[in-house]
Amino acid sequence: QAVPPYASENQTCRDQEKEYYEPQHRICCSRCPPGTYVSAKCSRIRDTVCATCAENSYNEHWNYLTICQLCRPCDPVMGLEEIAPCTSKRKTQCRCQPGMFCAAWALECTHCELLSDCPPGTEAELKDEVGKGNNHCVPCKAGHFQNTSSPSARCQPHTRCENQGLVEAAPGTAQSDTTCKNPLEPLPPEMSGTMLM
């Protein structure tokens, strides 16, 4: 079992993740682990020498880079916020700020926009991943209501008047809650006819 550096006639290395082919010497050499970079290239008699990334820089993968990447903050102007800091082994982790969704994607999200409002009587369909797409508004299910224009308001169950020792004065709709009244209160005049029936 050869250890790097070793000769390779077919230009491939046994461990593609941790080794790379060096064409000048036609050998396989070790890559540097995450959080490090190549400080001295390999030769036929000496393997790659790696050094730790300096503060504020990183390399995420096994690599044969001669520099580390500079850490960059998430861009708040683009609607992004940080969920995890940059370390020597990973870049800053970003996501869309609350109430926003990813509108431009290039390997990662680069630009977030405000979620659109869902009108009364609807709510945003719950997604697997927050911030991945704009709201898709769906009607409140039976027995529920939502009375605002909002990107995040959820449909709530109608109040059950009997649970509060009250009686229903007006039924709930998708956009409004049930109206309850004291059982001893007289009905308003416009509703008294319906009671007589």
Epitope: E55, N56, P73, E82, P85, T87, S88, Q93
Partner: antibody, heavy 116, light 107 residues
Framework: QVQLVQSGAEVKKPGSSVKVSCKAS????????LHWVRYAPGQGLEWMGW????????QYNEKFKGRVTITADKSTSTAYMELSSLRSEDTAVYYC?????????WGRGTTVTVSS | DIQMTQSPSSLSASVGDRVTITCKAS??????VAWYQRKPGDAPKSLIS???YRYSGVPSRFSGSGSGTDFTLTISSLQPEDFATYFC?????????FGQGTKVEIK
Amino acid sequence: QVQLVQSGAEVKKPGSSVKVSCKASGYTFTTYYLHWVRYAPGQGLEWMGWIYPGNVHAQYNEKFKGRVTITADKSTSTAYMELSSLRSEDTAVYYCARSWEGFPYWGRGTTVTVSS
Amino acid sequence: DIQMTQSPSSLSASVGDRVTITCKASQNVGINVAWYQRKPGDAPKSLISSASYRYSGVPSRFSGSGSGTDFTLTISSLQPEDFATYFCQQYDTYPFTFGQGTKVEIK
């Protein structure tokens, strides 16, 4: 060498605000995050939030959101932490710290006492 | 938020003793854990980052280990200047969180 010099101790009344400063030197102020952490004997160390002086953007711990404001003045390489609506539980030592895989550099701390 | 549960909360030991402090994260934090020493009236002192990397100037008797959720700080031979409170911290995700601290006292 990296130095973080903080303002002096403060005694405040409940309901008031306090503003603590942290002057940085020995490095490029705009390229490193500056955090604020507090220590109270009963509660241990608590992370409050950070500022990235390069774009003067701050992020906060939800626990302090609405009460804490972190700002920075690039011209003087100084960061500030203002805590409002003070209560007795805010009596603590407040530290600024520069981050990189933890907090390698800390200020000496500013003692804030909240008492009526 | 990620909880960092540190144990023990205090311990009594003698000069020369081997001391072990553990920290358990409520979820996987990789190796993104630091350890600090704090003495009354002083700023916390950074001892370890990346779970096991010892900062320059920190004596070799201090060592850190662990990954994922379980982490350990070991002082191989306790010295008089080591009597202090020790904290672990995760910097894997915001909000950063600390353990409650372990006070190392003289027996």
